[in-house]
């Protein structure tokens, strides 16, 4: 019906306004409404001006119309020509009464379909229904996925790509781990993934200054070390260092009036030379204190070495050896005096004998046919050595003796000359001063070691070698190496160490093979004024130990492998060290600090005498131990 109406209107327009000229009223009759007429008539006049000369009145005039005028006028009522709609967005244009209607394609809106609908912002279809990314485009939209995801066939949802499955070798020697939208090449702790080589490379933590003092990097990790020999230990954080603190303070008070006889491991403590009138005779008086059973107290000789006198201790008793042109004698007598008490000793040359007194009571009288030392040129020249003798004398002794003596002397009077001159020398030298109070035992001050050569091979045993150790300890610091067996290649195949426990005021004992702890005895209260007794036995098959709390045979998966390492070392040559380690790498053992405190050691049934050591740090006291420091009311 509408199209018929349109055709009728078109016919009327042709007849009324093109074949003839029409005025506005006549045009109104064609359109039958004002809006279309008002829209049409001004444009109609423009067409007439374009194709006819002269001005037009409203009067009817007959004329030959041009074809161009026809097309001009016919176009006027079509609101869709020229196209008012947005070409991209419209689907169709409908002509209306002096108006038009643009029908939009999906995705467009507006009177002329000029506005794109943003489907991605549609509240009724959140994110355009896309699971990840919604991309709005003119007149449309599409979904897309983030990197590492692929589009599903519904064009809306995304699926994670499992790169590890796609290419199992994508991480090379590392482990591939798929994560949403990506993958990771994972390395064990202590390793970092190298993208170029597609492999896990060791992180050199040491280059990152992880440790306060010393750092040793190894594949997959690192270990911090502190210079135990300088008194440091590793802190709880396993990175920083802290001072090895004293857990049992000792009374280290000394007095310069007391001369320490064991200042040197090998050598004389004091050397004096006397030039006296020829009528003089040898005499020596002094107070003496020791727990040592053997050693040289003093040695005196003539200036030409032809005559000598040795005052020593053997088996805890005074021994005198003498030699001159007339005689050669050795005598031991009196009570045992290595009891840690002060004993007054006097040795005096009389006309026909040498008298030895302890506490003013004669214990020996040694006959002599003439003077001990022969005067020359009217003078008696005598050399006196404390706690030792010149090296060449060793071969001349009537009976060999270990000269080392851990003891003290005081109130000395030599050759009846008093102590003048000597005290001044001693006063300036701290290490010649003796401790005021001592107890029985051996003292390791935390600054050195003692070395022994011990043969651990036991031919009679099927095991081939064994190490049976008994330790009586009273530590003063909670960290240090008590005993170590060291191989020629600077490894430590076995060590017994002390470390401060994580639990307060207690210590752990570590047994280690090389740098691996094979057993840890935890939380023992060892820093007390009482000695602790520890025993352990080790051979190539077993490890047994006993502490104040328990006796046990240790067995764990790794032990046999560690004992095999020890076995290999024991078949070669090992040196035994007490109180610490020699110059081995810091990484050779779990602990490298010196032991500080008292300790007595028995190995394979033999009580070790530090005077018998191959070498010993001078500060180690072989037969005396400082007393525990007692708090006084004033202090």
């Amino acid at each position: 019906a509408n199209s018929l109406l349109e055709e009728t209107k078109q016919g009327n327009l042709e007849r009324e306004c093109i074949e003839e000229l029409c005025n506005k009223e006549e045009a109104r009759e064609v359109f039958e409404n004002d809006p279309e007429t008002d829209y049409f008539y001004p444009k109609y006049l423009v067409c007439l001006r374009s194709f006819q000369t002269g001005l037009f009145t409203a009067a009817r005039q007959s004329t030959n119309a041009y074809p161009d005028l026809r097309s001009c006028v016919n176009a006027i009522p079509d609101q869709c020509s020229p196209l008012p709609c947005n070409e991209d967005g419209y689907m169709s244009c409908k002509d209306g009464k002096a108006s038009f209607t643009c029908t939009c394609k999906p995705g467009w809106q507006g009177e002329k379909c000029e506005f794109d609908i943003n489907e991605c912002k549609d509240p009724s279809n959140i994110n355009g229904g896309c699971s990840q990314i919604c991309d709005n485009t003119p007149g449309s939209y599409h979904c897309s996925c983030k990197n590492g995801f692929v589009m599903l066939s519904n064009k809306k949802d995304c699926k994670d790509v499992d790169e590890c499955s796609l290419k199992p070798s994508i991480c090379g020697t590392a482990v591939c781990k798929n994560i949403p939208g990506d993958f990771e090449c994972e390395c064990p702790e202590g390793y970092r993934y190298n993208l170029k080589s597609k492999s896990c490379e060791d992180i050199d933590e040491c280059s990152e200054n992880m440790c306060a003092q010393l750092c040793v990097n190894y594949p997959g990790g690192y270990t911090c070390y502190c210079d135990g020999k300088k008194g440091f230990k590793l802190a709880q954080d396993q990175k920083s260092c802290e001072v090895v603190s004293v857990c049992l303070p000792l009374n280290l008070d000394t007095k310069y009036e007391l001369l320490y006889l064991a200042e040197q491991f090998a050598g004389v403590v004091l050397y004096l030379k006397f030039r006296l009138p020829e009528i003089s005779r040898f005499s020596a008086e002094f107070d003496f204190r020791t727990y040592d059973s053997e050693g040289v107290i003093l040695y005196a000789e003539s200036i030409d070495h032809s005559a000598w006198l040795l005052i020593a201790l053997r088996g805890g008793k005074i021994e005198v050896q003498l030699k001159n042109e007339h005689t050669s004698k050795i005598t031991t007598g009196g009570d045992v005096i290595n009891n840690g008490l002060w004993n007054m000793v006097s040795v005096e040359e009389l006309e026909h004998s040498i008298s030895i007194k302890i506490a003013k009571e004669a214990v020996m009288d040694i006959n002599k046919p003439g003077p001990l030392f022969k005067p020359e040129n009217g003078l008696l020249e005598t050399k006196v050595y404390f706690a030792g003798f010149p090296r060449k004398v060793e071969s001349e002794l009537i009976k060999p003796i270990n000269p080392r003596l851990d003891g003290c002397i005081r109130s000395w009077n030599l050759m009846k000359q008093g102590a003048s001159g000597i005290k001044e020398i001693i006063q300036e030298k701290q290490n010649k001063h003796c401790l005021v109070t001592v107890e029985k035992g051996s003292y390791y001050p935390g600054s050195g070691i003692a070395q022994f050569h011990i043969d651990y091979n036991n031919v009679s045993s099927a095991e081939g070698w064994h190490v049976n150790v008994t330790l009586n300890i009273r530590p003063s610091t909670g960290t240090g190496v008590m005993l170590a067996l060291v191989s020629g290649n600077n490894t430590v195949p076995f060590a017994v160490s002390l470390v401060d426990s994580t639990s307060e005021k207690s210590q752990d004992i570590l047994l280690s093979v090389e740098n691996t702890v094979i057993y840890r005895i935890q939380a023992l209260s060892l820093c007390s004024d009482q000695q602790s007794h520890l025993e352990f036995r080790v051979n190539r098959n077993n490890l047994e130990l006993s502490t104040p709390l328990k006796i046990e045979t240790i067995s764990h998966e790794d032990l046999q492998r560690q004992l095999a390492v020890l076995d290999k070392a024991m078949k070669a040559k090992v040196a035994t060290y007490l109180g610490g380690l020699p110059d081995v790498p810091f990484s050779a053992t779990p602990v490298n600090a010196f032991y500080n405190g008292c300790m007595e050691v028995n190995i394979n049934g033999v009580q070790l005498d530090l005077d018998e050591a191959i070498s010993k740090h001078n500060d180690i006291r072989a037969h005396s131990c400082p007393s525990v420091w007692k708090k006084t009311k004033n202090s």
Epitope: H142, S144, C145, K146, N147, G148, F149, V150, M151, L152, S153, N154, K155, D157, C158, K159, V161, E163, L166, K167, I170
Partner: antibody, heavy 117, light 113 residues
Framework: QVQLQESGPGLVKPSETLSLTCTVS????????WNWIRQPPGKGLEWIGY???????DYNPSLKSRVTISVDTSKNQFSLKVTSVTAADTAVYYC???????????WGQGTLVTVSS | DIVMTQTPLSSPVTLGQPASISCRSS???????????LSWLQQRPGQPPRLLIY???NRFSGVPDRFSGSGAGTDFTLKISRVEAEDVGVYYC??????????FGGGTKVEIK
Amino acid sequence: QVQLQESGPGLVKPSETLSLTCTVSGGSISNYYWNWIRQPPGKGLEWIGYIYYIGITDYNPSLKSRVTISVDTSKNQFSLKVTSVTAADTAVYYCAALSGDHAFDIWGQGTLVTVSS
Amino acid sequence: DIVMTQTPLSSPVTLGQPASISCRSSQSLVHSDGNTYLSWLQQRPGQPPRLLIYKISNRFSGVPDRFSGSGAGTDFTLKISRVEAEDVGVYYCMQATQFPHLTFGGGTKVEIK
């Protein structure tokens, strides 16, 4: 929407290398697995291989020794190279997008490559 | 590799009548993720293939509902309920369960009687 267009020479001499490029338009190259498929005249479809945008590839075992697929993400293109071609490599070569549902959602129009001297 | 076998090779059909194409795999196409990645493609004469069905039975966008897929494990079927003239062409089944190794069936030609 994503569209694919193959390009490359239509004639290759025997023993030479066949090289084709597929240009991806209207979408991200990271959103699909990109494949090459060929169809000899009058025959069925043969999968050649695929590439994922990070460079992961896999090939049909029967062609593996001669085929290389590469990707240029900056140009939104991926390419196919087949070495030592013979007349048996004459085919229409299609590039196609494989979705996460492992289906070929999008296909190029295909390009005929003739191997002849 | 999985081998895909299609039957029949050719299927002459009367317009408006149903058609059925079978596809069999040499081993189960059930993936470890539980999905079965079997799809159907249509290739009209002189045109590239286009996706019809994915994951056995899911119709791809724009595909008329006269196309349907069914099956499980190793046996699968594509059905056209009423064949139209525009349905003429070769139909391929394809497995992607073994992705990234993909294999096509040999194809079935659908023609009008």
